[in-house]
Structures are given as structure tokens and as C-alpha cells.
């Protein structure tokens, strides 16, 4: 079987981590699209998506992951703001595509996410708590579940349950530095 | 509509084998991870082993690795559960269950009616 | 494994009145990524299988009666049937999904007082 890559990002708690999906422009664009985490011994998790059709630039939140589908560019954008020690695992961007399988985006991203230390970013837990907000015009949104081919363009989101957002903003162009490393499955 | 009957169940005597199938409809079959659940007599659920949608990975529970094997055949829309080594305790009502297309959940919308598994001498 | 412990075992409602089931997780079972709870609710009837009625801990499926809410995070969390109607009578179990194995409580028995 195919040896999947993996791009290795090492961050520290509070910080936020950045990366970018491409995919086929053309056979992809308005595709949906998500975010999974891949845990040992366990199947794919869906943790957000975008909507469907993905629009273009327009970001989706759930919980601390935003999401951004660059359709002029064949990107699709994850955030994972105010990382935890917990959130460290494998993740990959897939593209829903019902009802034929989620297609996969490659490299995978394995995140290990440490504690900070002492004026670093992270290091103090009450300062990261209230220090990310999603802009306004962020929709917050749930993957809706699909059920059949003959239901599936009328099936509208199962839900659009409360998805908190903490008060201060968040500066969308200063990502901390992270360090790539490749290295395979 | 959308439909999983399962198949196989029966008698069997300690150290034999069984096989169970489960036959899907109503959905794309191939898209979709599928799992069996089993319920013994007057008890609980317990989550038996998962397959995902083309079958190259497959998790099961510790009480029946290394003798169970769940397996499909996407051609013919059917969920397997190869049982061997059978023991008292696994009898049960074999379920399987196919969760959302998304796995966003990691619940079962759908459910078979089961098919009931007696192992005894 | 997660163990999933559910309370009471047994409960007797009379029709009309409040039923609440309570169910205990051995280690959180939300994702604090995405803020979701991976807890569901299900009701069985004798000599059927399970219906999902919860998930995400406080969503309903759709379908099910909205006198049927889930609440909680964390580790503790809790099914109300409102107003208790005599189709409720069922074994409700609670099941988590964050993580392999998936695992059940052992079930909670609702009956009309």
C-alpha cells in the first residue's frame, strides 16, 4: 500500500496552528469540505466542514476551528486557534463528495502540540482563554448528515448548535512560527 | 428505503465457527464505514468491531480479537462477521449498524433487526 | 475504554410526569476542538433494535419528540422525557464516540408507575 506523507507541526499551547489543503481546482471548488482527526486504532473523525456548496472565502467556525475555502486558488485553509496539549494527534483535509467516498487531501498533518513555557505564547492558561474571535461574519456551522442519494439536495444542516467564541480578536495574518517536518506513515 | 438484514445466525457448539452477513440497500453501501453491535440475552450493547468504507481498516473490541473478522464485499452490498473459536459468551444478537455518512456522530442511524448467535454444547 | 455507567437502573414514571437518566463517562468525552460532546442517547423496545434519539450529547435526530432532551459535558450527562407517554416505555442507553472502543452504559429501564 501507498506510504501517506505527513507534514509534522510542533507548537505550543495557545498558539494557533495554520495550513493550507490544495485540491483540484476544477473537480473540487464547490466541493464540501472537512476537517479530520485520525486518532491510533481508530476510524477518521469529522471535528468541522464547510458548507455545501463550499463557498468561496467565506469562513466557517466550529469551536476553535476555522475554516476557509479558496476557490480562486484551490486551497482550503484550516485554523485550529488556542491549541491544547489534547489536540495533538493526526489530522487530514478530506472532500466530501456523497455518494461516492470522501476523497483525501494529501500531505496529512501530525500536530504535537507542548506546553509553553514562561512568557511564551500559551505558557500563561488564563491568557490564552479570551484571546481568539472570530470576525462577525463567520457562520458557524455543522457538517450536515447525509442519508440517501434521493434526499440528499433537500437534506438541510442537522444543526447549528451554540459554538462559543471568546471576546478579544484575533490577528488572522500573525501565525506563529511553526517547524515542518516531513516525515512519513 | 434504506435497509440492513442480517443472516447467519444459529446454533453452533463452543470452538466452532460462524459467519454472519448483512445485506444493505436503500444507500451507497460503499460510502460508508459499517459496524456490528451485539446484545446478549436480557443485557447491554456492546460495540463488536468496525470496517471502513473500503475495508482497509478494520478495529475490533478485546473480547473478540483474534477470533473475530469483520469483512465486506462492496460488489454485492454485504457486511461480513467471520466467528471463530465461539465461545458461551458470545451469544447474542448480532447487529450491524451503519453510521453517518459524515462520521462526524460516531452514531448508528441505521440498524438491522439482528440475527441471534447461540453458542452451547 | 471508556466506561459509561448509567443511573438508575430501573426507573417507574407515572404518565404525564418527568423521567431523568442520568449517565457517568470515565473520561471526558468532548473533543475541546470542535466543543462537541461524542455522547448519543438510545431508546429500545423489546425485540427491536436500537433508535437513536441524542447525539452531540443535546441534539435531537430528527423525528424523535421534543419532550426527548439531552444535556451535560464532560462527564456527566443526562436524558429528560418531559412528560413521560406510555410509546416511552423502552430501555434507554447512553454510548460515547470519542473514542475506539466504542462503549455503552448498561442501560436504564423506564416503566409507568
Known amino acids: 500500500a501507498t506510504k501517506l506523507t505527513e507534514e509534522k507541526y510542533e507548537l505550543k499551547e495557545g498558539q494557533t496552528l495554520d495550513v493550507k489543503c490544495d485540491y483540484t481546482l476544477e473537480k473540487f471548488a464547490s466541493s464540501q469540505k472537512a476537517w479530520q482527526i485520525i486518532r491510533d486504532g481508530e476510524m477518521p473523525k469529522t471535528l468541522a466542514c464547510t458548507e455545501r456548496p463550499s463557498k468561496n472565502s467565506h469562513p466557517v467556525q466550529v469551536g476553535r476551528i476555522i475554516l476557509e475555502d479558496y476557490h480562486d486558488h484551490g486551497l482550503l485553509r484550516v485554523r485550529m486557534v488556542n491549541l491544547q496539549v489534547e489536540d495533538s494527534g493526526l489530522y487530514q483535509c478530506v472532500i466530501y463528495q456523497p455518494p461516492k467516498e470522501p476523497h483525501m487531501l494529501f500531505d496529512r498533518i501530525r500536530l504535537v502540540v507542548t506546553k509553553g513555557f514562561s512568557g511564551t505564547p500559551g505558557s500563561n492558561e488564563n491568557s490564552t482563554q479570551n484571546v481568539y474571535k472570530i470576525p462577525p461574519t463567520t457562520t458557524k456551522a455543522l457538517c450536515p448528515l447525509y442519508t440517501s442519494p434521493r434526499t440528499v439536495t433537500q437534506a438541510p444542516p442537522k444543526s447549528t448548535a451554540d459554538v462559543s467564541t471568546p471576546d478579544s480578536e484575533i490577528n488572522l495574518t500573525n501565525v506563529t512560527d511553526i517547524i515542518r517536518v516531513p516525515v512519513f506513515n | 428505503q434504506v435497509q440492513l438484514v442480517e443472516s447467519g445466525g444459529g446454533v453452533v457448539q463452543p470452538g466452532r465457527s460462524l459467519r454472519l452477513s448483512c445485506a444493505a440497500s436503500g444507500f451507497t453501501f460503499s460510502s460508508y464505514g459499517m459496524h456490528w453491535v451485539r446484545q446478549a440475552p436480557g443485557k447491554g450493547l456492546e460495540w463488536v468491531a468496525v470496517i471502513s468504507y473500503d475495508g482497509s481498516n478494520k478495529y475490533y473490541a478485546d473480547s473478540v480479537k483474534g477470533r473475530f473478522t469483520i469483512s465486506r464485499d462492496n460488489s454485492k452490498n454485504t457486511l461480513y462477521l467471520q466467528m471463530n473459536s465461539l465461545r458461551a459468551e458470545d451469544t447474542a444478537v448480532y447487529y450491524c449498524?451503519?453510521?453517518?455518512?459524515?462520521?462526524?456522530?460516531?452514531?448508528?442511524?441505521?440498524w438491522g433487526q439482528g440475527t441471534m448467535v447461540t453458542v452451547s454444547s | 475504554d471508556i466506561v459509561m455507567t448509567q443511573s438508575p437502573d430501573s426507573l417507574a414514571v407515572s404518565l404525564g410526569e418527568r423521567a431523568t437518566i442520568n449517565c457517568k463517562s470515565s473520561?471526558?468525552?468532548?473533543?475541546?476542538?470542535?466543543?462537541?460532546?461524542?455522547l448519543a442517547w438510545y431508546q429500545q423496545k423489546p425485540g427491536q433494535p436500537p433508535k437513536l434519539l441524542i447525539y452531540?450529547?443535546?441534539t435531537r435526530e430528527s423525528g424523535v419528540p421534543d419532550r426527548f432532551s439531552g444535556s451535560g459535558s464532560g462527564t456527566d450527562f443526562t436524558l429528560t422525557i418531559s412528560s413521560l407517554q406510555a410509546e416511552d416505555v423502552a430501555v434507554y442507553y447512553c454510548?460515547?464516540?470519542?473514542?475506539?472502543?466504542?462503549?455503552f452504559g448498561g442501560g436504564t429501564k423506564v416503566e409507568i408507575k
Open positions: 449498524a451503519r453510521p453517518d455518512y459524515y462520521s462526524s456522530r460516531g452514531v448508528f442511524d441505521i
Open positions: 454510548q460515547q464516540s470519542h473514542s475506539t472502543p466504542l462503549t
Open positions: 452531540w450529547a443535546s
Open positions: 473520561q471526558s468525552v468532548l473533543y475541546s476542538s470542535n466543543n462537541k460532546n461524542y
